[in-house]
């Protein structure tokens, strides 16, 4: 039977080395066996490159394409093929579809005067455009109480957050995770980082009296 695309490719770039496209077929498909995504930078002399997609679900395919350090002017021509049949054709400008890399190495340290210091790493090297453009969202949640959670927006440069222990329940186990976005690129949010967990052993002041 004929091969058809149900939801056409949606692509995002980490704006440093990789662009990822995902699409849905109209029936379960062995993506790597049946499909190929060709991509070519619209630039004089650029060669055509081929991405072999993988299955994310039965009918969902995903392709990760290595790209050079992206710049604003880059535009890629994309063609989705099933053998000799062209299923879809479109263009993709990485700078207009940025999904930042996930922040890394989230850690929690006890700090002076009953505060917790949350630290993580900026996922971009200093020379990359996005390094100084990222802002973060930190989600802190009580592992045993789904209603006890807080969201912090970190809009200053440093990848850190100071958290007063008194704002959390004493003796409770908390988990934190962080994600990033780049406002000037109108990006989507990055994926959440892996969670890190700690015990909030702050003793309320009243108990000292």
């Amino acid at each position: 039977g004929s091969v058809k695309v149900l939801h056409e490719p949606s692509c995002f770039s980490d704006y440093i080395s990789t662009s990822v496209c995902q699409w849905k077929m109209d029936h379960p498909t062995n993506c790597s066996a049946e499909l190929r995504l060709s991509y070519q930078l619209d630039f004089m002399g650029s060669e055509n490159h081929t991405c072999v997609p993988e299955n994310r679900e039965d009918s969902v395919c995903v392709c990760s394409m290595p790209i050079d350090d992206a710049v604003e002017a880059d535009v890629y021509q994309l063609d989705l093929w099933a053998g000799q049949q062209l299923l879809w054709s479109g263009s993709f400008q990485p700078s207009k579809h940025v999904k930042p890399r996930t922040p890394g190495n989230l850690t929690v340290h006890p700090n002076i005067s009953h505060t917790w210091l949350l630290m993580w790493t900026n996922p971009y090297p200093t020379e990359n455009h996005l390094h100084s453009e990222l802002t973060y969202m930190v989600n802190v949640s009580n592992d045993n109480d789904p209603e006890d959670f807080k969201v912090y927006n970190v809009t200053y440069m440093g990848p850190t957050l100071r958290l007063a222990a008194s704002t959390l329940k004493s003796g409770a186990s908390y988990s934190a995770r962080v994600r990033a976005w780049a406002q000037t690129y109108n990006s989507t949010w990055s994926d959440w980082s892996p969670s890190t967990t700690w015990l909030n052993y702050y003793e309320p002041w009243e108990q000292h009296l």
């Epitope: 630039f43 004089m44 650029s46 060669e47 055509n48």
Partner: antibody
Framework: EVQLVESGGDLVKPGGSLRLSCVAS????????MTWVRQAPGKGLQWVSL????????YYADAVKGRFTISRDNAKNTLYLQMNSLRAEDTAVYYC??????????????????WGQGTLVTVSS | DIVMTQTPLSLSVSPGETASISCRSS???????????LDWYLQKPGQSPQGLIY???KRASGVPDRFSGSGSGTDFTLRISRVEANDTGVYYC?????????FGQGTKLEIK
């Protein structure tokens, strides 16, 4: 030493055909785009055509489109320019030159960093 | 097509002086920060052209530092300091950004 040696230039009548060759040595030929540039007697430089490293992409000046064909044989480290339906205004010295590195996603550009010695094509009855 | 315009078309300079050649493009040659696709070439009498400057300001291998390129977008300049007799020839600018590649008309440099 990086070197380009052109050959194939000749005297040919209008409407005739000619094939120029350019043999490359001293660099990874298949990784670089190659370009032909010509120079009419006493005139300036005019770009003719470019071919990517794999040969998959070709570009032509409007003046030669449909008449000239650029190609390459990476196994022989040789660039070609097939010239058909030649006209008097095609009379020129034809140079081959090494252009951008095209094995990367975005070609790396160094200008036309090596040129051949040129081969003269004369179109006259 | 991108039109390249060079000025002056001829230039006469005494040895040891500085020569400047201007090149203007009809469209911006800036692809991204620091990447202006503008080259300078020298064709000495009876010889093939040779590359001097690429990407606006980067010297080609073996080119003396007396040759320098500057400019961005649409306006570029080639400067040759401490001019020598050996610098005689025709200087061309060329845009390498998009097809068709286009050259300036050339500037003939004569040493007095």
């Amino acid at each position: 030493e990086v070197q380009l040696v052109e050959s194939g230039g000749d005297l040919v009548k209008p409407g005739g055909s000619l094939r120029l060759s350019c043999v490359a040595s001293g660099f990874p030929f298949r990784d670089f785009a190659m370009t032909w540039v010509r120079q009419a007697p006493g005139k300036g430089l005019q770009w003719v055509s470019l071919i990517s490293g794999s040969g998959g992409k070709t570009y032509y000046a409007d003046a030669v489109k449909g008449r000239f064909t650029i190609s390459r044989d990476n196994a022989k480290n040789t660039l070609y320019l097939q010239m058909n339906s030649l006209r008097a205004e095609d009379t020129a010295v034809y140079y081959c030159a090494v252009d951008r590195l095209t094995k990367t996603i975005r070609p790396q550009y160094y200008g036309l960093w090596v040129w051949g010695q040129g081969t003269l094509v004369t179109v006259s009855s | 097509d991108i039109v390249m315009t060079q000025t002056p078309l001829s230039l006469s300079v005494s040895p040891g002086e500085t020569a400047s050649i201007s090149c203007r493009s009809s469209q911006s040659l800036l692809y991204s920060i620091g990447y202006n696709y503008l080259d300078w070439y020298l064709q000495k009498p009876g010889q093939s052209p040779q590359g001097l400057i690429y990407l606006g300001s980067k010297r080609a291998s073996g080119v003396p530092d007396r040759f320098s390129g500057s400019g961005s977008g649409t306006d570029f300049t080639l400067r040759i300091s401490r001019v020598e007799a050996n610098d005689t020839g025709v200087y061309y600018c060329m845009q390498g950004l998009q097809s068709p590649l286009t050259f300036g008309q050339g500037t003939k440099l004569e040493i007095k």
